[in-house]
């Protein structure tokens, strides 16, 4: 399946409609800043094989359709932005699975690689965390919006494995 | 390999305009906001004001607000810091220094050289 | 604004020493302090940042602390490359700010 140019192609399309969803400047919400700890280490010191890639990847983009498919960040976000960037996530993550089961067979069940996945929904689970904490400011989601762009452009080794023959 | 190339030193005479610029290159010009920061002669370091590169947003020091434009050009990767008509107090180093934005990372880890200006008649 | 207040303005001392400066803040700035080295001619160099994490590259010997309002600088055996000018700053808020700086002279 040629997932690298397609996902690049939706990543980069998904960035630019997470760019353009700001309401308010940032630079009123300096003291919001949080750290939110996405592991780059563990993945940057981690060779991942095209199944494990993809896997992670889906769960990232899975977990960010979730955090953007909320009440709370209905009430955030400028609507038709924010449809048309859970349109491209949606999208994402059926390439994804389509990948999938291109790469591994029906039959088969990818290597579910759990450490990443759980350092993932961790990662997640902190973000949601502090949206809880800071009562859904208007400065929390701009906090968390550019996180989520910084961890979308993060994720080079993955993308990496996605290029890779298993 | 991450750089911050600002433009050469510049005389001027008092009442001249000017530009600076300060060119991005080796990562993502858009994804880090850009400040500039003044050091007058044998003097210490001020923050003059800062700009998101992304949508040319910018937040200026109450000390600079009216004196100084900060802009950008995000398909050249540049920053620009211009005066309408300098003073002899503007005489100074400036230095710009890319800075994370909203994300938890180091603050102005990378800084370009450095532009002097004189203004004198 | 923030007022960012070092101490000591300069001081002396010899290699091997242990040196520290302090930074005090007019407010609440929580840990978000960083550190600069600055040499004469040059570019600031960014040491310390969040109050505590060490810059990549930077020598170990090097260590930040502090939060809310009192942080402190340590070289805890200065080197010759050492001796130069140290910047904290405020990121906590706009305006950014920074202290007046501490010279680090060979006594």
């Known amino acids: 399946c040629d997932l690298p140019q397609t996902h690049s192609l939706r990543n980069r399309r998904a960035l630019i409609l997470l760019a353009q969803m700001g309401r308010i400047s940032p630079f009123s919400c300096l003291k919001d800043r949080h750290e939110f700890r996405f592991p780059e280490e563990e993945f940057d010191g981690h060779q991942f094989q095209k199944t494990q890639a993809i896997s992670v990847l889906h769960e990232m983009i899975q977990q960010t359709f979730n955090l953007f498919s909320t009440e709370d960040s209905s009430a955030a976000w400028e609507q038709s932005l924010l449809e048309k960037f859970s349109t491209e996530l949606y999208q994402q993550l059926n390439d994804l699975e389509a990948c999938v089961i291109q790469e591994v067979g029906v039959e088969e069940t990818p290597l579910m690689n759990e450490d990443f996945i759980l350092a993932v929904r961790k990662y997640f689970q902190r973000i949601t965390l502090y949206l809880m904490e800071k009562k859904y400011s208007p400065c929390a989601w701009e906090v968390v919006r550019a996180e989520i762009m910084r961890s979308f452009s993060f994720s080079t080794n993955l993308k990496k494995g996605l290029r890779r023959k298993d | 390999e991450v750089q911050l190339v600002q433009s050469g030193a510049e005389v001027k005479k008092p009442g001249e305009s000017l530009k600076i610029s300060c060119k991005g290159s080796?990562?993502?010009?858009?994804?880090?906001?850009i400040g500039w920061v003044r050091q007058m002669p044998g003097k210490g370091l001020e923050w003059m004001g800062i700009?998101?590169?992304?949508?040319?947003?910018?937040a200026y020091s109450p000390s600079f607000q009216g004196q100084v434009t900060i802009s950008a050009d995000k398909s050249i990767s540049t920053a620009y810091l211009q005066w309408s008509s300098l003073k002899a107090s503007d005489t100074a180093m400036y230095y710009c220094?890319?800075?994370?934005?909203?994300?938890?990372?180091?603050?102005?880890?990378?800084w370009g050289q450095g532009t002097l200006v004189t203004v004198s008649s | 604004d923030i007022q960012m207040t070092q101490s000591p303005s300069s001081l002396s001392a010899s290699v091997g020493d242990r040196v520290t400066i302090t930074c005090r803040a007019s407010q609440s700035i929580d840990r978000a302090l960083n550190w600069y080295q600055q040499k004469p001619g040059k570019a600031p160099k960014l040491l310390i940042y969040?109050?505590?994490s060490l810059q990549s590259g930077v020598p170990s010997r090097f260590s930040g602390s502090g939060s809310g309002t009192d942080f402190t600088l340590t070289i805890s055996s200065l080197q010759p490359e050492d001796f130069a000018t140290y910047y904290c700053?405020?990121?906590?808020?706009?305006?950014?700010?920074f202290g007046q700086g501490t010279k680090v002279e060979i006594k």
């Open positions: 220094a890319r800075h994370p934005g909203l994300n938890w990372a180091p603050d102005f880890d990378y």
């Open positions: 969040f109050a505590s």
């Open positions: 700009i998101d590169p992304s949508d040319s947003d910018t």
């Open positions: 080796g990562y993502s010009f858009t994804s880090y906001w």
């Open positions: 700053q405020q990121s906590f808020d706009f305006p950014l700010t």
